[in-house]
């Protein structure tokens, strides 16, 4: 199967990806363009204009300038200048600012909490199954199987720390060797990058926002996939990670450390533990073939227990199992002995919602999955709206310049490395790469951070999560200390190796180009984002898992032809773009293949057929929600609801159906300014539009 042609041009022809860019008008010369220099090479920019939007409220015929879709949008200040406000207006503006900050922090708090609950939900739904993946004996001999198990388990439990801790306990109890654990850790690294990709899907409403957000999220995925693609074979051939980490571990003089500091968890735990609490040991026990754990619930019921060591009479299979002959006796049938038994007495129940419901894990998991996704989505929308209203004009300029500008020459190259350190530091503070990268995603979407800057921040996040793991390892008990430290170090050096591969030389920053390519496709065909998610995080790993279970001959028999076809297609694609004359005329493009094999258009038509009936009801629902939101936020009455209906409305406009209101994020003052109707500042007027 040939690649989709859209992958080929990540940015050369932006007009191809901008909806409604049908007629280009001459560019007004007086418009100043905000250039955005990042630590990546500059990209040629094509300027062109969109047709004006017509509205019953106001007619805006201001010529619109559209740059390269990857250039950051100009966040215009639509509010009234501070100097033009009266005292009442100034006070109101300050209070609005404080209010917005409180709201932003509040939504950010619930956003992080919902990520935590989402992880718990995934563990309840797929945790036991994930645990059973580990009990597969083929992991030892098949690194590829280890890799996909790492991916699948982390995707199912939505937590790389859970899958890593299972691996640690398996290594500590000799069920797994460090050599066999390394591919699983690599897989866990890939699996953890799904969270911010899911978060990016929440920004599907706005094409340009979604393009940036999705690319910003998938840059993490591509970095991890590419790192594994290179480093797994290297590790299998040389075992460099195992050797290096073993040398480091052996040079340590161990002392059990303090517990790894819980920083963000201190704030979020009091809330999340009221929702649900899980007994994480159950998944580890299943992974370690503990039959009794299979019937245990993951939902924690008793939070306060008293463990007492007591001497208990227990039956044993034979006299050989007796602690001593004098401490053995019979009841006539069974042999009994006295053993020290730890007796667990339940004292106090947990204080979460599900403690008294006695629902099956799957039911609790599904309930929490729905709720957490709704909260996550709601918080994300509100964060984006608040940031959209705050980050305008001067504030936006300052923030964008601070984040995206390089150090002066000759130290420009250092900027990215500082970003890596910032990413690592921030991740260390929030104790989760998922939380950090998920918080980064909407910022990329709304255009505060460029993908070129988000990339090193994400790489730093990968490092940050491993330093947390190293600290946790140093605090672990004696029996697991060595194995947990070695695995944490393997994780650390894997990420360092990945950064050395895909960051220092701008030419090697393939993840950025790949993510942009995927961002372009996903902006044009939004269903492709979900398709990508399913294929890369579920279908491919599950297929490899199935083939691995069938044995090496089957895996090689299927894998080699597939890899050969992929390499052939990539080589052909490279030749087509670089030196097409070398190829025969027929191979200079993909037209020799059926359309469905080299274009997403036919697939789009099929999917549209299926999703068509759901678009109208969904849109109505969106409108109602948006109207309520507008009432609560005090948006202008004429605001168009909602962005997710944009395409539908564009379709209606094309058919001559008038659309009644301007964009949701457009501010009424812009429209008035366009008509020269700016009124005197009023205390009731918004600071900046929400």
């Amino acid at each position: 199967m040939a690649p989709w042609p859209e992958l080929g041009d990540a940015q050369p022809n932006p007009s191809k990806y901008l909806e409604g860019a049908t007629s280009q008008q001459p560019i007004t010369p007086d418009k100043s363009k905000e250039t955005n220099k990042t630590d990546n090479t500059e990209v040629p920019v094509t300027k062109f204009e969109l047709l004006p939007t017509y509205s019953t409220a106001t007619l805006i015929e201001e010529p619109t300038e559209v740059d390269d879709p990857w250039n950051l949008p100009t966040l215009q200040d639509s509010g009234i200048k501070w100097s033009e406000r009266d005292a009442k207006g100034k006070i109101l503006c300050v209070f609005q600012g404080i209010g917005r900050l409180i709201l932003l922090l509040g939504f950010l708090y619930f956003f992080v909490c919902s990520l935590d609950v989402l992880s718990s939900a995934f563990q309840l739904v797929g945790g036991k199954m994930a645990g059973q993946f580990f009990s597969n004996s083929s992991i030892m001999s098949n690194p590829l199987l280890g890799l996909v198990i790492g991916v699948l388990v982390t995707v199912f439990v939505q937590s790389s720390s859970t899958s890593t801790s299972i691996v640690v306990s398996m290594v500590a109890s000799s069920l797994l060797t460090v050599r066999a654990a390394i591919p699983i850790i690599m897989g866990a690294n890939i699996g953890t990058s799904i969270t911010n990709t899911i978060v990016a899907l929440m920004q599907v409403g706005d094409r340009s926002e979604f393009r940036r957000a999705f690319a910003g999220a998938t840059v993490h995925d591509f970095f991890n996939w590419l790192s594994v693609l290179v480093l797994l074979p290297v590790e299998v051939a040389t075992h460099y990670l195992e050797v290096v980490t073993q040398l480091i571990v052996e040079s340590f003089h161990f002392k059990n450390g303090e517990d790894a500091p819980d920083l963000l968890k201190v704030i979020t735990k009091p809330f999340t533990k009221l929702i649900v609490q899980l007994d994480k040991k159950v998944i580890s026990q299943i992974a370690m073939n503990d039959e009794t754990a299979k019937n245990k619930s993951l939902v924690k019921i008793w939070c306060k227990t008293f463990t007492n060591m007591t001497q208990m009479n227990v039956t044993v299979p034979s006299m050989a199992n007796c602690t001593s002959p004098s401490l053995c006796w019979t009841d006539g049938i069974q042999i009994w002995t006295m053993k020290n038994v730890t007796y667990k007495e339940n004292i106090a129940k947990c204080q979460h919602i599900f403690v008294n419901f006695h629902l099956p894990d799957l039911a609790v998991g599904i309930i929490l999955l729905i709720i957490s996704l709704l909260v996550l989505c709601g918080c994300l929308i509100m964060i984006v709206k608040i940031l959209g209203s705050v980050l305008k004009g001067q504030v936006a300029t300052v923030i964008k310049k601070t984040i995206n500008t390089d150090f002066p020459f000759p130290f420009a190259w250092l900027t990215g490395y500082l970003a890596i350190l910032v990413g690592a530091g921030m991740t260390f503070i929030v104790q989760s790469s998922s939380v950090f990268t998920s918080a980064l995603t909407p910022l990329i979407g709304i255009g505060v951070i460029t993908i070129e800057r988000a990339y090193p921040l994400t790489l730093g996040s990968n490092i940050g999560t491993t330093t947390t793991a190293i600290l946790a390892a140093l605090a672990s008990p004696g029996n697991t200390l060595r194995s947990s430290l070695q695995i944490a170090l393997c994780h650390f050096f894997f990420n360092i190796s990945g950064i050395l591969l895909w960051y220092p030389i701008p030419f090697t920053r393939l993840p950025i180009r790949m993510a942009k390519g995927l961002g372009n496709i996903s902006a044009k065909y939004r269903w492709f984002a979900i398709f990508y998610l399913i294929i890369f995080f579920f279908l491919i790993p599950l297929t490899v898992f199935g083939l691995s279970l069938a044995g090496w001959p089957v895996l090689v028999g299927v894998g080699v032809p597939v890899v050969f076809i992929i390499i052939l297609v990539l080589c052909l694609r490279l030749l087509q773009s670089r030196c097409p004359r070398v190829l025969p005329k027929k191979l200079q493009n993909w037209n020799f293949l059926p359309l469905c094999m080299h274009s997403l258009k036919p697939w789009d038509a099929v999917i549209s057929k299926f999703t068509g009936p759901f678009q109208m009801p969904c849109c109505c629902c969106c409108r109602v929600c948006c109207r309520v939101c507008c009432l609560l936020c005090g948006c202008p009455k004429c605001c168009r609801c909602s962005k997710c209906c944009q395409d539908l409305e564009e379709g209606q406009e094309a058919q001559g159906v008038p659309v009644k209101a301007p964009e949701t994020f457009d501010n009424i003052t812009i429209s008035r300014e366009a008509q020269g109707e700016v009124r005197a500042p009023d205390s009731k007027t918004e600071c900046t539009a929400l």
């Epitope: 009479n313 401490l327 053995c328 006796w329 019979t330 006539g332 049938i333 069974q334 042999i335 009994w336």
Partner: antibody
């Protein structure tokens, strides 16, 4: 209160078989072992074997293996012992006794079943 | 099989006397020993288990001691109803075995 009531005395011919019962009440039949003990006239006590009514698991004194068969009926809370191929030395009083949970002491005993083997 | 040897086999005593019966095991049985009292024509009755623990309803004048291979049953002050045959039993291993018995008679 705990009671163990055994079946009446038996007089049997050599080579024949006898099946005696031990009906229990006052406790959960399936939780304790049921032991059987032989006492020949003017002699001491001799352990024959035990049964755990909960699972039907049995253990026998090697001396009686093949001659004694222990069974239990949970529905009637009754234990049975069948003695086969009887000889004159099998003449004795046979007691059923409840085993204390977790060890081999016998806390409650039946009144005994007298078996006389005579031609 | 573990053999239990009781001594004496016969014992004559008067009401109010302090009486001690000994039971020796052929190998270490820990404390897995019980003592029974049997009156003529009656079923045995449990007195002591775990070598020293008195069974419910057994008068305090009966006490047991010992561990390993030597055990004793002591009646601190003989009562008229105490004249009977006494058996020790081990339950350290199968088969369970009893001592040959000690017959306590009125002097």
């Amino acid at each position: 209160q705990v009671q163990l009531v055994q079946s009446g005395a038996e007089v049997v011919k050599p080579g024949a078989s006898v099946k005696m019962s031990c009906k229990t009440s006052g406790y959960t039949f399936t939780t304790n072992n049921m032991h059987w003990v032989k006492q020949a006239p003017g002699q001491g006590l001799e352990w024959i074997g035990a049964i755990y009514p909960g699972s039907g698991a049995t253990a026998y004194n090697q001396k009686f293996k093949g001659r004694a068969t222990l069974t239990a009926d949970k529905s009637t809370s009754t234990a049975y012992m069948e003695l086969s191929s009887l000889r004159s030395e099998a003449t004795a009083v046979y007691y059923c006794a409840r085993g204390m949970y977790g060890h081999g002491a016998m806390d409650y005993w039946g009144q005994g079943t007298s078996v006389t083997v005579s031609s | 099989d573990i053999q239990l040897t009781q001594s004496p086999s016969f014992l004559s005593a008067s009401v109010g006397d302090r009486v001690t019966i000994t039971c020796k095991a052929s190998q270490d049985v820990g404390t897995a020993v019980a003592w029974y009292q049997q009156k003529p024509g009656k079923a045995p009755k449990l007195l002591i288990y775990w070598a020293t623990t008195r069974h419910s309803g057994v008068p305090s004048r009966f006490s047991g001691s010992g561990s390993g291979t030597e055990f004793t049953l002591t009646i601190s002050s003989l009562q008229p109803e105490d004249f009977a045959t006494y058996y020790c039993q081990q339950y350290s291993s199968n088969p369970l075995t009893f001592g040959q018995g000690t017959k306590l008679e009125i002097k």
